[in-house]
């Protein structure tokens, strides 16, 4: 999906009002020095691409993020503020339902959510002349 035509300000508002707090809740009890952010993004569409990938694509050691509250709210924000996003996600959602497993918060998941916080920071404030 091409995130170029999303309403970035509305997504930012959704992040700051609820998603950010859910990410903090998920990370509660984790030391702030524990993880280095290794995933970066250069502009807002790129940040959303990386955010989508880390939030919804299962990775080795962390298969369950898509069922977390922050992920569901992220999905809702993208569906509302990115034209045509919902349609592109129907097949992915059906595939995910077949893979459904119980929720386990692993260290790998905590690291992944730390990366997500970093990506959202860059989405909120990209280091570009034109934001």
């Amino acid at each position: 999906y091409d995130f170029t035509n999303c309403d970035f300000e509305k997504i930012k508002a959704a992040y700051l009002s609820t998603i950010s707090k859910d990410l903090i809740t998920y990370m509660s009890g984790t030391k702030s020095t524990e993880f280095n952010n290794t995933v970066s993004c250069s502009n807002r569409p790129h940040c959303l691409t990386e955010i989508q990938s880390l939030t919804f694509n299962p990775t080795a050691g962390c298969a369950s993020l898509a069922k977390e509250m922050f992920a569901m709210k992220t999905k809702a924000a993208l569906a509302i503020w990115c034209p045509g996003y919902s349609e592109t996600q129907i097949n992915a959602t059906q595939a995910m339902k077949k893979r459904r497993k119980r929720k386990v918060t692993t260290n790998k998941c905590l690291e992944q959510v730390s990366q997500l916080q970093g990506l959202w920071r860059r989405f909120n404030r990209p280091l570009l002349k034109q934001q």
Epitope: L16, S32, N37, G118, R121, N124, R125, K129, Q131
Partner: antibody, heavy 119, light 107 residues
Framework: EVQLVQSGAEVKKPGSSVKVSCKAS????????IEWVRQAPGQGLEWMGV????????NYNENFKGRVTITADKSTSTAYMELSSLRSEDTAVYYC????????????WGQGTTVTVSS | DIVMTQSPDSLAVSLGERATINCKAS??????VTWYQQKPGQSPKLLIY???NHYTGVPDRFSGSGSGTDFTLTISSLQAEDVAVYYC?????????FGQGTKLEIK
Amino acid sequence: EVQLVQSGAEVKKPGSSVKVSCKASGGTFSNYLIEWVRQAPGQGLEWMGVIDPGQGDTNYNENFKGRVTITADKSTSTAYMELSSLRSEDTAVYYCAREDNTGTAFDYWGQGTTVTVSS
Amino acid sequence: DIVMTQSPDSLAVSLGERATINCKASQSVSSDVTWYQQKPGQSPKLLIYYVSNHYTGVPDRFSGSGSGTDFTLTISSLQAEDVAVYYCQQHHRFPLTFGQGTKLEIK
């Protein structure tokens, strides 16, 4: 607890350069932007520029006409701000600050470094 | 550059009374406004981010509102420790810019 500790006060001659350091502790240095802000005596706050220590990306206030250079050393968790071609109007307290967890504000500030430019 | 203009430049309010500081942007900054408090001889402290969100530990007598070009910081019941200079800041466009500051004193 995150702390930003800046280098000591400096007295400089007009035309010279100054390099102020900002050492971070208590957080992951490379994960957060470091900003530089200055405050002339009795005046308000002026944003100078920002660095992403993880990527090395920077953005500067063009009002400084290329006189500002911001760098970061990940190995020592230290950011630096160098200001060249100093003039008397550059006399100010220089602050480093770290972005907050949302990327929308500066939540931790250094104690400030006084730079005096005088002949 | 986006110019942030605060009003008034200084303000004297009685203890327990409401203090209101305004900030006007020269063009729309959406909701990308932050408020800082600076006491004499100290570094600035973050109060409110993204117009109306309290930073951790900030008393709820502080509140922020507005959008677009007009923003307000309100202290609902002034306390002695609130004497300081208050700055608004926009982070919607580079370069980031601050208001000139509003000095708040006790009447």
